[in-house]
């Protein structure tokens, strides 16, 4: 990519953060070995990456979780990458699912999501999970990012 | 990306190689359908990708492994993407984990890691696993790569 | 990337489509929140992404499936990303595998594949699975795409 004013590099990689909130939206932080290329992408309220320029973006998320089939609901663990366009309803871009493990007290599993999507100026992307209390926040296990093509 | 002298394309994709070494660092080779764009990224000692230019890189790894919960330690199989900056200690960039299968003698599972990270000139990245003897080296199952944004 | 005539952005993201065909090649559609940057990449016969320009591409696929070890053949579920170069035999680029779940009637699992490969003009890529009837086609669960570096 050119790095001139016309077409600066836009990229972000943020790190998961444990949260006491009961919301299913994962929380993220600019900590550890994070990336935030410039102010054309920002982390808002610790929960969503918001872009200022229209274009195609490769967006990805990785979620590691620890669950047990007896202790969990019967439904699988699902991670969803969601889009909130400006002034419009949110929609699902990508989802992945894993059935719970029989390991005790819980079994670790990792999910990776990634895809190319058109984002409008002011669009935000965020990650939803079925049970945020099961997410693993150890170094490197859960992260979220994007890059503008 | 421009392909002029100022901003050449930098990309690599290397293929797993079985190793008799007992190290937890995976071994890779330029074989099969591999990619090595130019000498601005190199595979060193068959174990790490080293870059000559500073910048943001999307780095990824995929590891397929075959494990069994009785035969393995109780700890999950963990794959780690690690960074060795020049003249500094190594650090973990990304990790993923999967609990062992109950299949006999072992059950196959795949892990995918990927994220955007700033690399300095001379920085190396490599992949670590908890048990390299469980890694599957059949065509296409285990690979490692990067691209400069 | 420059967006001039010389080096236009080339990217695609297509969405899985259920098929009555018994072929192991997955079917895709330009539906939902899909991406097709221009006619330098096309979806052919609903099954393969074909590119018109030579170069390095990051190619990815995500497959979510629901299987049960009793109801399935006992072999693992395997997803393969395959290349069909013009006038040459197809070859495997990437594969991932997951052992079947014991959940009833079936357990969800997701596989993600991604890597950087050189494609020739007219080359096609497609996704093969061991049992297409097990693939989950709900919003966001199964998708396929590429971007030219």
């Amino acid at each position: 990519m050119q790095k001139g004013d016309q077409n600066p590099q836009i990229a972000a990689h943020v790190i998961s953060e444990a949260s006491s909130k009961t919301t299913s939206v994962l929380q993220w932080a600019e900590k550890g070995y994070y990336t935030m290329s410039n102010n054309l992408v920002t982390l808002e309220n610790g929960k969503q990456l918001t872009v200022k320029r229209q274009g195609l973006y490769y967006i990805y998320a990785q979620v590691t979780f620890c669950s047990n089939r007896e202790a969990s609901s019967q439904a699988p663990f699902i991670a969803s990458l969601c889009l909130k366009p400006p002034n419009r309803f949110e929609r699902i871009l990508l989802r992945a699912a894993n059935t719970h493990s029989s390991a005790k007290p819980c079994g670790q599993q990792s999910i990776h999501l990634g895809g190319i999507f058109e984002l409008q100026p002011g669009a935000s992307v965020f990650v939803n999970v079925t049970d945020p209390s099961q997410v693993s926040h150890g170094t490197g296990f859960t992260s979220f990012g994007l890059l503008k093509l | 990306m421009q392909k002029g002298d100022q901003n050449p394309q930098i990309a690599a994709h290397v293929i797993s190689e079985a190793s008799s070494k007992t190290t937890s660092v995976l071994q890779w080779a330029e074989k099969g359908y591999y990619t090595m764009s130019n000498n601005l990224v190199t595979l060193e000692n068959g174990k790490q990708l080293t870059v000559k230019r500073q910048g943001l890189y999307y780095i990824y790894a995929q590891v397929t492994f075959c494990s069994n919960r009785e035969a393995s330690s109780q700890a999950p199989f963990i794959a780690s993407l690690c960074l060795k900056p020049p003249n500094r200690f190594e650090r973990i960039l990304l990790r993923a984990a999967n609990t062992h299968s109950s299949a006999k003698p072992c059950g196959q599972q795949s892990i995918h890691l990927g994220g955007i990270f700033e690399l300095q000139p001379g920085a190396s990245v490599f992949v670590n696993v908890t048990d390299p003897s469980q890694v599957s080296h059949g065509t296409g199952f285990t690979s490692f790569g990067l691209l400069k944004l | 990337m420059q967006k001039g005539d010389q080096n236009p952005q080339i990217a695609a993201h297509v969405i899985s489509e259920a098929s009555s065909k018994t072929t192991s090649v997955l079917q895709w559609a330009e539906k939902g929140y899909y991406t097709m940057s221009n006619n330098l990449v096309t979806l052919e016969n609903g099954k393969q992404l074909t590119v018109k320009r030579q170069g390095l591409y990051y190619i990815y696929a995500q497959v979510t499936f629901c299987s049960n070890r009793e109801a399935s053949s006992q072999a693992p579920f395997i997803a393969s990303l395959c290349l069909k170069p013009p006038n040459r035999f197809e070859r495997i680029l990437l594969r991932a595998a997951n052992t079947h779940s014991s959940a009833k009637p079936c357990g969800q699992q997701s596989i993600h594949l991604g890597g950087i490969f050189e494609l020739q003009p007219g080359a096609s890529v497609f996704v093969n699975v061991t049992d297409p009837s097990q693939v989950s086609h709900g919003t966001g669960f199964t998708s396929f795409g590429l971007l030219k570096l």
């Epitope: - | 075959c66 006999k104 003698p105 196959q108 599957s136 059949g138 | 072999a75």
Partner: antibody, heavy 118, light 107 residues
């Protein structure tokens, strides 16, 4: 219908090696495991090792470790078992068999008689 | 290694008899126990897998039971074609091991 067809009988000298092949047809050989089991004349069954052909993972019985090598060629749907440093007590019928999730062996080759004699 | 002990080592029975063969593991193998039938000069044939699951195509007169260390193969009504040697096999841990076999002969 899955079929496993093994190579023909062999007569070998002590200290030499033998390589037995097992070609699969009629099923998805490559995504299952292949085990090798031997049976000495008038004796019971003895498991030697296992390979997952397309993945390349192997497991060996400790008794044969270092003396047996199991390989597979995905392109030809063929598995191989090579046993080195042969001795007279290795005289046996060697079977390949397809192994499934629970470690059961559901399809067997016809067997290959290997005779070790000076 | 896990030792598998079958009993009896041989038995004589008549057509129509109910026959029971037992297999004991030297340590718990959960349900990872398989049963095979072998006739002279032939390869073994899978009858029962995972302790009690009947292999496709095998007559329903064959059944398996047990878990942990003690397992049983039962032939509810012996048929002429059932005279053979029967082996149990554990697949819980490497190396997989077989019992020494039980030969079922005509009385």
């Amino acid at each position: 219908q899955v079929q496993l067809v093994q190579s023909g009988a062999e007569v070998k000298k002590p200290g030499s090696s033998v390589k037995v092949s097992c070609k699969a047809s009629g099923g998805t050989f490559s995504s299952y495991g292949i085990s090798w089991v031997r049976q000495a004349p008038g004796q019971g069954l003895e498991w030697m090792g296992w390979i997952s052909p397309i993945f390349g993972n192997t497991n060996y019985a400790q008794k044969f470790q270092g003396r047996v090598t199991i390989t597979a060629d995905e392109s030809t749907s063929t598995a191989y078992m090579e046993l080195s440093s042969l001795r007279s007590e290795d005289t046996a019928v060697y079977y390949c068999a397809r192994s499934r999730y629970y470690g059961d062996l559901d399809y067997w080759g016809q067997g290959t008689l290997v005779t070790v004699s000076s | 290694d896990i030792q598998m002990t079958q009993s009896p080592s041989s038995l004589s029975a008549s057509v129509g008899d109910r026959v029971t063969i037992t297999c004991r593991a030297s340590q718990s193998i959960s349900s990872y126990l398989n049963w095979y039938q072998q006739k002279p000069g032939k390869a073994p044939k899978l009858l029962i897998y995972y302790a009690n699951s009947l292999q496709s195509g095998v007559p329903s007169r064959f059944s398996g039971s047990g878990s942990g260390t003690d397992f049983t193969l039962t032939i509810s009504s012996l048929q002429p074609e059932d005279f053979a040697t029967y082996y149990c096999q554990q697949s819980d841990s490497i190396p997989w091991t077989f019992g020494q076999g039980t030969k079922v002969e005509i009385k």
